[in-house]
């Protein structure tokens, strides 16, 4: 039987010669556990592992801690790859995080973080970010220093309220903070003055719910 090549991220797949965007099987670091992920092999040189996508409101993002841990949705459509996989892979070496955003007027913007990783579940998948560049704001819309991840059944935010229940979706809420890319999906003409929408404050300001978002990671040395 031919030995199957194991990829821990889309950068490894790309470097092995697989340069077509699509869904690939990735293996957790130091384990045989597998997950399906969408690989963007075109944007900025390719090799990007997509960890989140919003585009049409077809998937419910008001999910439990376990669902955000393991991932949900379809890699080729709206999905969350899974905090456990992302935590494990981003602790192996330095990764960059690119967040691509689209509004309802046809504008696009991005935020690129030079170093991104998630703490383990023991530390509530706390987000760590350094070195912001890009066109989606001069200040990070994910609060720095990073916060713990919260879901509707795991309130780890810094608010006396429950941000995940109030704003919907799992996110690294502060109190509650200037972003939530896992908020409620609002269609065009219903996307303004929404406190619980898909928010990236330092690009579109308060109340604007975005049309589409993609979060993707790649090794810094790619």
């Amino acid at each position: 039987k031919e030995e199957q090549i194991i990829f821990r991220d889309c950068a490894e797949a790309f470097k092995s010669g697989l340069t077509t965007s699509g869904t690939y099987t990735l293996t957790f670091p130091n384990s045989t556990e597998e997950t399906k992920a969408y690989c963007d092999m075109e944007t900025g040189g390719g090799g990007w592992t997509v960890i989140q996508r919003r585009e049409d409101g077809s998937v419910d993002f008001q999910r439990t801690w376990k669902e955000y841990k393991m991932g949900f949705g379809s890699p080729s459509g709206e999905h969350w790859l899974g905090n456990e996989f992302v935590s494990q892979v981003t602790n192996q070496k330095r990764y960059v995080l690119k967040i691509h955003l689209r509004d309802w007027e046809g504008n696009e913007a991005y935020s690129l973080y030079e170093h991104f990783y998630l703490s383990s579940e023991e530390f509530n998948y706390r987000i760590h970010l350094k070195g912001l560049t890009g066109t989606a704001g001069k200040i990070s819309s994910i609060s720095q220093p990073g916060n713990d991840f919260s879901t509707k059944d795991a309130d780890n935010d810094k608010c006396i309220c429950k941000c995940s229940q109030m704003l919907t979706g799992g996110w690294w809420f502060d109190a509650c903070g200037p972003s939530n890319l896992n908020g409620m999906y609002y269609p065009q003409r219903q996307n303004t003055n929404k406190f619980n929408g898909i928010k990236w404050y330092y690009w579109k300001g308060s109340g604007y719910s975005l049309k589409a978002t993609t979060m993707m990671i790649r090794p810094a040395d790619f």
Epitope: H115, H128, L129, K130, G131, K138, I139, Q144, P145, G146
Partner: antibody, heavy 115, light 107 residues
Framework: SEHLVESGGGLVKPGGSLRLSCATA???????MSWVRQAPGKGLEWVGS????????YLNTKFIGRFTISRDDSKNTLYLQMNSLRAEDTAVYYC?????????WGQGTLVTVSS | AIYMHQEPSSLSASVGDRVTITCHGS??????VAWYQQKPGKAPKLLIF???FKVYEVPSRFSGSGSHEDYTLTISSLQPEDFATYYC?????????FGHGTKVEIK
């Protein structure tokens, strides 16, 4: 902010030297950092800035030849070396994250130049 | 260096008043202007950048406006915690420069 903590201020005689330090949280590693000072009862004055790897430094022209900015990312520390100090250098010195504007500030350290 | 002429240098106002502070740069600034609030013994706090973009945590009563050389900070309804000194800053050109400040005092 506990994420930027200045130290090294104090009383120094005119003509003396002082090195200020700013202990930075590690998430500032890839950011430009600046020193800003404020004389007692006066306004704010930008001293200079330094890029993430320390390869680009911008100093307010009035401090060229006397002040030097550096950083040691292995220690998460920003420095301001001040030589040939004058009475008019008496001020609170702040370190700040520099995005052009300053969105994170330390609590400041007081430098008094007096004989 | 770009000179930032800030007016007034001080003002007395009451809680609930609308307060306006202006800054005039000696050259075109392309909206690269920030506003800060400073209380005695404390570091400045960023309120507004890019002329009119409010920092997320800052209350909605604070707003910035302006273009070219002229910029304004407005507090729509002054609150007790707003009594402080306010500074404008330009970051279009090195060296970055600040206005001389406006002290907002209780009438």
């Amino acid at each position: 902010s506990e994420h930027l903590v200045e130290s090294g201020g104090g009383l120094v005689k005119p003509g003396g030297s002082l090195r200020l330090s700013c202990a930075t949280a590690d998430f500032f590693e890839y950011d430009d950092m600046s020193w800003v000072r404020q004389a007692p009862g006066k306004g704010l004055e930008w001293v200079g800035s330094i890029s993430p790897k320390g390869d680009h430094k911008y100093l307010n022209t009035k401090f060229i030849g006397r002040f030097t900015i550096s950083r040691d990312d292995s220690k998460n520390t920003l420095y301001l070396q001040m030589n040939s100090l004058r009475a008019e250098d008496t001020a609170v010195y702040y370190c700040a994250r520099d995005v052009g504007f300053f969105d994170w500030w330390g609590q400041g350290t007081l430098v008094t130049v007096s004989s | 260096a770009i000179y930032m002429h800030q007016e007034p240098s001080s003002l007395s106002a009451s809680v609930g008043d609308r307060v306006t502070i202006t800054c005039h740069g000696s050259y075109w600034l392309n909206s690269e202007v920030a506003w800060y609030q400073q209380k005695p013994g404390k570091a400045p706090k960023l309120l507004i950048f890019d002329g009119d973009f409010k920092v997320y945590e800052v209350p909605s009563r604070f707003s910035g406006s302006g273009s070219h050389e002229d910029y304004t900070l407005t507090i729509s309804s002054l609150q007790p915690e707003d009594f402080a000194t306010y500074y404008c800053q330009q970051y279009r050109y090195h060296p970055y420069t600040f206005g001389h400040g406006t002290k907002v005092e209780i009438k």
